[in-house]
Interface confidence: medium
């Protein structure tokens, strides 16, 4: 209690001033449950038996609500996409109660994080992407998606990052709000693919035989699984995989004084076949 | 209230191009994923194209892949077919719908705006 | 490609009697997920499409529960079980399990008799 000290001035019957001071013991007056929780935050967690939501409310005591729909500040069985009113109160603070309208959002099973990248160019990118697999009556408008990838943040139900590092591991978090409360989470961590190998070096490429030529090479740095040479003679065109070890390659059964183009490339079968870049050479058999 | 209206059909000459418009309103157009499906006259239904709620996807079937294109633009609640090298066979209306997501199902289509190749 | 085959094509009903189409799918349907993404839509004469059922058997809400779908694996069924004057139109099978490509029916006219 405060002690609240109030003067009062009266005339008395003579006419005289007469000052008197009366001391009361006063409460501070309580705030209204309404004003109190009027900015409680809740937390949705989904039971995976039951299907059903519990909502923890987010205060420091222990409150009550009406007709003891809730136990450790926790409402419990919640079915996805009602709403649900309680009435807080605690005896710290006065009527009127706190009318919360808890706003459930739909089940957790029903959502998915798929990988959306294109086997093609996941050497390079990815995709995630949020999917929705099972019907719920809440209002879609009131979903939001998140993702962070790194210090990048895309509030987007799919994402796509670009201009990656092949055989790279990224991690990504995302999470799912229904009216700004989140409801879900899901980390995803995805390796780029193997990137396209690089460019062989050739070393040197030259006939010395009438019906035989011979072509040397450096291998790329990165990852591979075999070469590819192929070599033309005006239109026709011959290719042979050669075993990934082999620096070194002799063309038998060339025909005379022609020219022969050969390429030469590494290629990985990774998600999907990805050839490196062919290095180019050339030269003309002797003459029988 | 959700709503999604075509428009920019219209008469072209085979080869021709035309650019059809989609304006979504009244839901959260960036969590659909959208098709454009097409109904020649007298005839039936024929899905043309599908976007991923982001973009990222797109999808068509072989009778126009290569000649049409799907875009959205989410910011501005829109999508976008792009028909180049047009045939007589394209005649059609054509209609956008939302797909919640690619395993979902077409619960709202616009009224369709009608495209006419002929010479 | 998946093709979705319906019959009949023409289906004249006496109002108040029932109606039955059939959907049969060139291969079979059901998606890795364990999942049937079969659905039917109905288009009354100058109107788009309508969702009518989806997931093979689900009833789309504000639809009257006069029309059922049933079926598996490769054979779908849309029974109406008293038909009114409103449902005249076309109604259209369509598979959504092979993705990208979707496929509709070729459409099954229903009349009144």
């Known amino acids: 209690a405060y002690l609240n000290a109030s003067e009062t001035t009266t005339l008395s019957p003579s006419g005289s001033a007469v000052i008197s001071t009366t001391t009361i013991a006063t409460t501070p007056s309580k705030p209204t449950c309404d004003e109190k929780y009027a900015n409680i935050t809740v937390d949705y967690l989904y039971n995976k038996e039951t299907k059903l939501f519990t909502a923890k409310l987010n205060v420091n005591e222990n409150v009550e609500c009406g007709n003891n729909t809730c136990t450790n500040n926790e409402v419990h069985n919640l079915t996805e996409c009602k709403n649900a009113s309680v009435s807080i109160s605690h005896n710290s603070c006065t009527a009127p109660d706190k009318t919360l309208i808890l706003d459930v959002p739909p089940g957790v099973e029903k959502f998915q994080l798929h990988d959306c990248t294109q086997v093609e160019k996941a050497d390079t990118t990815i995709c995630l992407k949020w999917k929705n697999i099972e019907t719920f009556t809440c209002d879609t408008q009131n979903i939001t998606y998140r993702f962070q990838c790194g210090n990048m943040i895309f509030d987007n139900k799919e994402i796509k990052l670009e201009n990656l590092e092949p055989e790279h591991e990224y991690k990504c978090d995302s999470e799912i709000l229904y009216n700004n409360h989140k409801f879900t989470n899901a980390s995803k961590i995805i390796k780029t693919d193997f990137g396209s190998p690089g460019e062989p070096q050739i070393i040197f490429c030259r006939s010395e035989a009438a019906h035989q030529g011979v072509i040397t090479w450096n291998p790329p740095q990165r990852s591979f699984h075999n070469f590819t040479l192929c070599y033309i003679k005006e239109t026709e065109k011959d290719c042979l995989n050669l075993d990934k070890n082999l620096i070194k390659y002799d063309l038998q059964n060339l025909k005379p004084y022609t020219k022969y183009v050969l390429s030469l490339h590494a290629y990985i079968i990774a998600k999907v076949q990805r050839n490196g870049s062919a290095a180019m050479c050339h030269f003309t058999t002797k003459s029988a | 209230q959700v709503q999604l209206v075509e428009s920019g059909g219209g008469l072209v000459k085979p080869g021709g191009s035309l650019r059809l418009s989609c304006a979504a309103s009244?839901?959260?157009?960036?969590?659909?994923?959208m098709s454009w499906i097409r109904q020649a006259p007298g005839k039936g239904l024929e899905w043309v194209s599908y976007i991923s709620s982001g973009g990222v996807s797109t999808y068509y079937p072989d009778t126009v892949k290569g000649r049409f294109t799907i875009s959205r633009d989410n910011a501005k609640n829109s999508l976008y077919l792009q028909m180049n090298s047009l045939r007589a066979e394209d005649t059609a209306v054509y209609y956008c719908?939302?797909?919640?997501?690619?395993?979902?199902?077409?619960?709202?289509w616009g009224r369709g705006t009608l495209v006419t190749v002929s010479s | 490609d998946v093709v979705m085959t319906q019959s009949p094509l023409s289906l004249p009903v006496t109002l108040g009697q029932p109606a039955s189409i059939s959907c049969r799918s060139s291969?079979?349907?059901?998606?890795?997920?364990?999942?049937?993404?079969l659905e039917w839509y109905q288009q009354r004469p100058g109107q788009s499409p309508r969702l009518l059922i989806y997931k093979v058997s689900n009833l789309f809400s504000g639809v009257p529960d006069r029309f059922s779908g049933s079926g598996s694996g490769t054979d779908f069924t849309l029974k109406i079980s008293r038909v009114e004057a409103e449902d005249v139109g076309v109604y259209y099978c369509?598979?959504?399990?092979?993705?990208?490509?979707?496929?509709f029916g070729q459409g099954t006219k229903l009349e009144i008799k």
């Open positions: 009244g839901f959260a157009f960036s969590n659909y994923d």
């Open positions: 369509f598979q959504g399990s092979h993705v990208p490509m979707y496929t």
């Open positions: 291969q079979s349907i059901v998606h890795s997920n364990a999942k049937t993404y």
């Open positions: 719908a939302r797909r919640y997501d690619v395993w979902w199902y077409f619960d709202v």
